[in-house]
Amino acid sequence: KAMHVAQPAVVLASSRGIASFVCEYASPGKATEVRVTVLRQADSQVTEVCAATYMMGNELTFLDDSICTGTSSGNQVNLTIQGLRAMDTGLYICKVELMYPPPYYLGIGNGTQIYVIDPEPCPDSD
């Protein structure tokens, strides 16, 4: 079943290469287990950047070598992606799955365009 997911259209990463955005989903029921995946769509590729499964009210547990961290509050997930560089600029899509209890729901956001600007190197001081 389909579910609406909202996320900001544009986010500018910090000078330290950190970008944060909120992914909000309109839960049709009372899900207890939720899976959130961040997809990057750019360069004619789709990459699952990070994924987390969490029980409502608990911390997000990210899978694998995650460059993401996050917290949840109700139907909102606050996501942070770290270590970004200019080449990582692209469309970052939030995908939310309500895993339990049935029925299964899937929602995919329209994406957040994350812009990353590499900091200028400090000029040499004499």
Partner: nanobody, 125 residues
Framework: EVQLVESGGGLVQTGGSLRLSCAAS????????MGWFRQAPGKDREFVAA????????AYADSVKGRFTPSRDNAKKMAYLQMNSLKPEDTAVYYC??????????????????WGQGTQVTVSS
């Protein structure tokens, strides 16, 4: 580095399926992100798909998304590429590659330092 040997290529008709295998030996396989690339005659080598060290995260070229799926079995030191709904434009030599790095946003550009010898996939119309 790890040593990689591919198998599973062959001749298949349009719409058919193949499963490529990549056997690794040497260093700890689970320390490597695995990628799949292909090179068609007269063309540059291009990224096809990749899979993270534990197998939980994947990446795909737009041209194969929904048709190709990478997977891995760390206990067996094996990586796989399941290819469905094959098209003539999928004809190429397919290579598996290993990168000793964690996952990130651009796995197509990871420093793959180990490559297999390649396996030919031919899709006839």
């Amino acid at each position: 580095e790890v040593q990689l040997v591919e198998s599973g290529g062959g001749l298949v008709q349009t719409g058919g399926s193949l499963r490529l295998s990549c056997a690794a030996s040497g260093r700890t396989f689970s320390n490597y992100t695995m990628g799949w690339f292909r090179q068609a005659p007269g063309k540059d080598r291009e990224f096809v798909a990749a899979i993270s060290r534990s197998g939980s995260l994947k990446a795909y070229a737009d041209s194969v998304k929904g048709r190709f799926t990478p997977s891995r079995d760390n206990a067996k030191k094996m990586a796989y590429l399941q290819m469905n709904s094959l098209k003539p434009e999928d004809t190429a030599v397919y290579y598996c590659a290993a990168a000793p790095v964690p996952w990130g946003t651009r796995p197509s550009l990871f420093p793959y330092d180990s490559w297999g010898q390649g396996t030919q996939v031919t899709v006839s119309s």
